[in-house]
């Protein structure tokens, strides 16, 4: 006769492991008992259990409640046992020793491999600001057994670097994603992808990039200078910029206070019916937590009763 077993049995942490040991004997042969032992114990073989043909399953106190026979129906030549709720410490070599009559004893070894799936974590780097050089966007760490694979899925251009730390029964892998921040990256997803044989599918953690920036400011509304004449209604100036975080707007007049009746509504400066008193230099001040910008325009309100020509200058400063 001969023993049938597996070279390697692989289970995920917390699952039950079936340790197979089947005696394929000749006609008339019987199994008296099957002894299971840890074969890699430093102080020699440590008995797990003994399956006796007459007196049943004997379990080592160290494995009390964790070693069982497979559910019925059972073949008297089957010495397989179930190891409940596998933990990392169970990983190692096991020996099955089958005592038969009249053929004698047979033994076989198998390796139990316990997969520990990772629980990945993603940590964003420091605040990203346009104008910075190569900067850490995020790091992703996953620990498991065996070592997990950590990669990145993103449309953003960047560089990755990985390092691994080995522990006694597992390994931690950390991958960093570096980039040169630009406003086009704002709102883009950066996804950490963790692969591991103990996972049914890859684990993904997504981080949305936030890059602080503030665009140059400009003022619209003076494109047709002929419209800025005494008596015109609905004249307005609009300050244009964009930023992250979204900027706030403030309007001032360089050569004095804002004329009465002029309304400030965020990025828009609204005028009452125009008079020559509305002529002057207006400044739009745009700011967010990252930076600030100014843009100024000169308004000349034309009085048709005057023959003098009109002139409008646009100046932008930051």
């Amino acid at each position: 006769g001969e023993l049938e077993t597996s070279d390697v049995v692989t289970v995920v942490l917390g699952q039950d492991a079936k340790l197979p040991c089947f005696y394929r004997g000749d006609s008339g042969e019987q199994v008296g008992q099957v002894a299971w032992a840890r074969a890699d114990a430093g102080e020699g073989a440590q008995e797990l259990a003994l399956l006796h043909s007459k007196y049943g399953l004997h379990v080592s106190p160290a494995y009390e409640g964790r070693v069982e026979q497979p559910p019925p129906p059972r073949n008297p030549l089957d010495g397989s046992v179930l190891l409940r709720n596998a933990v990392q410490a169970d990983e190692g070599e096991y020996e099955c020793r089958v005592s038969t009559f009249p053929a004698g004893s047979f033994q076989a070894r198998l390796r139990l491999r316990v997969l520990v799936p990772p629980l990945p974590s993603l940590n964003p780097g420091p605040a990203l600001e346009e104008g910075q050089g190569l900067t850490l966007a995020a790091s992703c760490t996953a620990e498991g057994s065996p070592a997990p694979s950590v990669t990145w899925d993103t449309e953003v251009k960047g560089t990755t670097s990985s390092r691994s730390f080995k522990h006694s029964r597992s390994a931690a892998v950390t991958s960093e994603f570096h980039l040169v921040p630009s406003r086009s990256m704002n709102g883009q997803p950066l996804t950490c992808v963790v692969s591991h044989p103990g996972l049914l599918q890859d684990q993904r953690i997504t981080h949305i990039l936030h890059v602080s920036f503030l665009a140059e400011a400009s003022v619209r509304g003076l494109e047709d200078q002929n419209l800025w004449h005494v008596g015109r209604e609905g004249a307005m100036l609009k300050c244009l910029s964009e930023g992250q975080p979204p900027p706030s707007y403030n309007w001032t007049r360089l050569d004095g206070p804002l004329p009465s009746g002029v309304r400030v509504d965020g990025d828009t400066l609204g005028f009452p019916p125009l008079t020559t008193e509305h002529s002057g230099i207006y400044v739009c001040h745009v700011s967010n937590e990252f930076s600030s910008r100014d843009s100024q325009v000169t308004v000349d309100v034309l009085d048709p009763q005057e023959d003098s020509g009109k002139q409008v200058d646009l100046v932008s400063a930051s």
């Epitope: 003994l50 379990v59 106190p61 009559f101």
Partner: nanobody, 118 residues
Framework: EVQLVESGGGLVQAGGSLRLSCAAS????????MGWYRQAPGKLRELVAS???????WYVDSVKGRFIISRDSAKNTVYLQMNSLKPGDTAVYYC????????????WGQGTQVTVSS
Amino acid sequence: EVQLVESGGGLVQAGGSLRLSCAASGSIFDINLMGWYRQAPGKLRELVASITRGGSTWYVDSVKGRFIISRDSAKNTVYLQMNSLKPGDTAVYYCAAESIGSYTFDRWGQGTQVTVSS
């Protein structure tokens, strides 16, 4: 030839404890299993607990959580610690040994009486 000698029996009140000992001598290296049987008057002898050379144990359902079988290889002795005893545990307790390859308990002690009063 293996010889088995039990001790530790006696009279105890319900809820009390006793510790039985079984000292083995002779060809002890031939022993595969050792166990404790009991036989109450008018009843069949039943296996209560057994222990392997490697220390793995088996218990009959009625004593699980109350009885503990253990062994001291240096002293060639097997023990049965009996806690939370009940009147139904009253019986003669026998130590038994199974020789390697026999697959049945084939060596017996003389027995020790355990009486649990209510």
